[in-house]
Interface confidence: medium
């Protein structure tokens, strides 16, 4: 079930001939309130790019702008995961990555950003108006999700700019914190107050909202305890669904665990033991479509293409089995 809340976006005041300063002064408390609420709260950005080389191949990049540690990233298409969206990949900092077709290569780019390449052919490949969503679960901020899609008129090879358009889901209480944003905001507010403290008090005017204003759109969290914070957010509902996937498929997109780590901890014989011997990386990623689930000792930095050996935390085994780069 999906619950949608639509909230008008905050609009900047429109200064008229009279009362321009009044509007600005009136908005100060709101600016302060906004800063206080958003300071320390993370944001998720999503960038969707259509590759020039393969017209139906997409690259999705997502990042988390927050100070917490990321515990899980879920990438879905067709809407948020669990709300009509189909999971494409799940990235876990320690247990590795599992991806489903048409995802071809998912990987960590930095400690707080990931990228996902979708295969460009076949019935299950995406099309230009598909919506892609990234959900970052972090501690202590909670769960944060944003969606993005390719602009309708995008040329191949061009990308939609990173869109920090989050659906904010506060799974955990206390998403406040002192940050540079708050500091800057407070300094700026003080500066404005100092500049305008001798101006006459303005007339109160109702703030105007543009009918074209983007609307906040929030999907109800799966747990009752989750409070939804609505931020201005615009999405394009996908009318193009992969032919091989069920439209009602919240979890299921297709296929297997791929592994990822370039800095990996090797598990030796015996499921109980963990060795600290790192395996040197020879690049960043090999997609293993059979369902490899590899241990990442730490999230790998962005490295060049190539081959990586993937140890696995899931039991006593040597490198064996299919390592098919899709």
């Amino acid at each position: 079930m999906r619950t949608e809340a639509q909230v008008p976006a905050l609009q900047p005041p429109e200064p008229g001939l009279e009362g321009a300063m009044g509007h600005r002064t009136l908005v100060l408390p709101w600016v302060l309130l906004t800063l206080c609420v958003t300071a320390g709260t993370p944001e998720v950005w999503v960038q969707v790019r259509m590759e020039a080389t393969e017209l139906s191949s997409f690259t999705i990049r997502c990042g988390f702008l927050g100070s917490g540690s990321i515990s899980l990233v879920t990438v879905s298409w067709g809407g948020p995961n669990g709300a009509g969206g189909t999971t494409l990949a799940v990235l876990h900092p320690e247990r590795g990555i599992r991806q489903w077709a048409p995802a071809r290569q998912a990987r960590w780019e930095t400690q707080s950003s990931i990228s996902l390449i979708l295969e460009g052919s076949g019935a299950s490949s995406p099309c230009a108006n598909t919506t892609f969503c990234c959900k970052f679960a972090s501690f202590p901020e909670g769960s944060w999700e944003a969606c993005g899609s390719l602009p309708p008129s995008s040329d191949p090879g061009l990308s939609a700019p990173p869109t920090p358009a989050p659906i904010l889901r506060a799974d955990l209480a206390g998403i406040l914190g002192v940050s540079g944003v708050l500091l800057f905001g407070c300094v700026y507010l003080l500066h404005l107050l100092r500049r305008h403290k001798h101006r006459p008090a303005p007339r109160l005017q109702p703030s105007r909202t543009s009918p074209q204003a983007p609307r906040a759109r929030a999907w109800a969290p799966s747990q009752a305890s989750q409070a939804a914070l609505h931020v201005p957010y615009a999405t394009i509902n996908t009318s193009c669904r992969p032919a091989t996937l069920d439209t009602a498929h919240p979890h299921g997109g297709p296929s297997w665990w791929a592994s990822l780590p370039t800095h990996a901890a090797h598990r030796p014989q015996g499921p109980a033991a963990w060795a600290s011997t790192p395996i040197p990386a020879r690049g960043s990623f090999v997609s293993v479509e059979n369902g490899l689930y590899a241990q990442a000792g730490e999230r790998p930095p962005h490295t060049g293409p190539g081959l990586t050996l993937f140890p696995d935390p899931r039991g006593p085994r040597a490198m064996e089995g299919p390592l098919g780069v899709r």
Partner: antibody, heavy 123, light 111 residues
Framework: EVQLQQSGAELAKPGASVKLSCTVS????????IHWVKQRPEQGLEWIGG????????VSASKFQDKATITADTSSSTAYMQLSSLTSGDTAVYYC????????????????WGQGTSVTVSS | DIVLTQSPASLAVSLGQRATISCRAS??????????MHWYQQKPGQPPKLLIY???NLESGVPARFSGSGSGTDFTLNIHPVEEEDAATYYC?????????FGGGTKLEIK
Amino acid sequence: EVQLQQSGAELAKPGASVKLSCTVSGFNIKDTYIHWVKQRPEQGLEWIGGIDPAIGNTVSASKFQDKATITADTSSSTAYMQLSSLTSGDTAVYYCARERVHSNTLYYAMDYWGQGTSVTVSS
Amino acid sequence: DIVLTQSPASLAVSLGQRATISCRASKSVSISGYSYMHWYQQKPGQPPKLLIYLASNLESGVPARFSGSGSGTDFTLNIHPVEEEDAATYYCQHSRELPPTFGGGTKLEIK
């Protein structure tokens, strides 16, 4: 020895819910996925969904999305599946199974299975 | 969902002869040379038992008379020579996409 021990048979009324359990031994439940498969009388096998107990991540078939809820408790090495709003169509044997662990590959091939739990929905 | 069609639905084979079971997928289940098809054996009142994984790999403990082959959309399970204990229903299962699906089953009888 790897074993998956499932809970006993259930007789339920339409509209009710049942929660099946699958307790594993002989391996660490965190090391692989646990899947649930449905088999109706004299019929074939249907994959319901699976869970990675280590992180609680679940995947499931769309047709069972509103029917089955899969969870796991790593401290007791037990996976659970709750079936809700039962109808006669839910009458079946439900198996839990371990995703095949070999080398460092997992393929959703299931190498060890529980003995099955029979669920009968009848008024 | 990928549909797996098994044939024949039932099969009677003389002891010591070859049993051949086919499984056809509605779309390819192979990628980069690897085929995500598995075979199971199920006897009445028992859970399924994994025989073959990734089209042709024999699961540990399974007799060598079982073999699997195929790629793309067409796969075959061969049992040779057939023994009395092989009487069972055999299922193919793909893992190319979610949801993994099973074939309808082939019931093998020993003559």
